[in-house]
């Protein structure tokens, strides 16, 4: 088993992950591991020499770059926040700030926008991944209500008056909770079934 550098007449290298083809010398050379870069290129008699990336720079993969890539902060103006700092082997990991979703994607999120409000009587459909898309509002299911315009408010179950020793004065709707009253309280006139003459 040859070790780099070794001749290759068919332009292919045995280890596609850790080697690259150098066409002018027709040889396979070692790539540099993540966190490093090429400080001296390979030749027919000497393999690639790698060096560690300086602070605030990185290379994520096996590479033959002659520089490390500069770490970039998460841009709060674009609605991004940091979830993991940059290391020599990994770029800064960003995500959308709370209440925002990714509106522009190019290999990673580049721009977040505010989530749309869901109107009363609805809530945002739960997604597998937070921040991936704008809200899709769905009606509250039976027995639940939501009474605000909000991107994040959840439908809540209607109050069960009997659990509090009360009786129902007005039924709940998708936009309002059940109204309860003391069983000894008379019904307001507009709700009483009989009218006194």
């Amino acid at each position: 088993q040859a070790v780099p550098p070794y001749a290759s007449e068919n332009q292919t290298c045995r280890d596609q992950e850790k080697e690259y083809y150098e066409p002018q010398h027709r040889i396979c050379c070692s790539r540099c591991p993540p966190g490093t870069y090429v400080s001296a290129k390979c030749s027919r008699i000497r393999d690639t020499v790698c060096a560690t990336c300086a602070e605030n720079s990185y290379n994520e993969h096996w590479n033959y770059l002659t520089i490390c890539q500069l770490c970039r902060p998460c841009d709060p103006v674009m609605g991004l926040e940091e979830i993991a700092p940059c290391t020599s082997k990994r770029k800064t990991q960003c995500r959308c700030q709370p209440g925002m979703f990714c509106a522009a994607w190019a290999l990673e999120c580049t721009h977040c926008e505010l989530l749309s409000d869901c109107p009363p009587g609805t809530e945002a459909e739960l997604k597998d991944e937070v921040g991936k898309g704008n809200n899709h509002c769905v009606p509250c299911k039976a027995g639940h209500f939501q009474n605000t315009s909000s991107p994040s408010a959840r439908c809540q179950p209607h109050t069960r008056c009997e659990n509090q020793g009360l009786v129902e004065a007005a039924p709940g709707t998708a936009q309002s909770d059940t109204t309860c009253k003391n069983p000894l309280e008379p019904l307001p006139p507009e709700m009483s079934g009989t009218m006194l003459m």
């Epitope: 332009q11 083809y21 002659t66």
Partner: nanobody, 117 residues
Amino acid sequence: DVQLVESGGGLVQPGGSLRLSCAASGRFFGIYDMYWYRQAPGKQRELVAISTSGGHTNYADSVKGRFTISRDNAKNTVYLQMNSLRPEDTAVYYCNIQRVDAPGFYWGQGTLVTVSS
């Protein structure tokens, strides 16, 4: 994955010109070195021109001064402008790209160039 499609080959008279294109599609992102090779009937594939990610170009001695390699990164395309063509330039021309910042090595299917009167 990445696909490379060459175009622009054909039959041309000696002294004529052709421009070959190689368009990359699929999951094409990152930093690449780009190459043109050619293979004449019964011969080994040979390197014709290089365009590195750093902007350097280089050529086989047999095509220096006649061929020019260029790239349009916005269109994910590499070109080979071939002038003053000779019968000995007849070959299948292959585009090859190699990712610099991560593993990745891809070939096109080739385009035939025939120089004949």
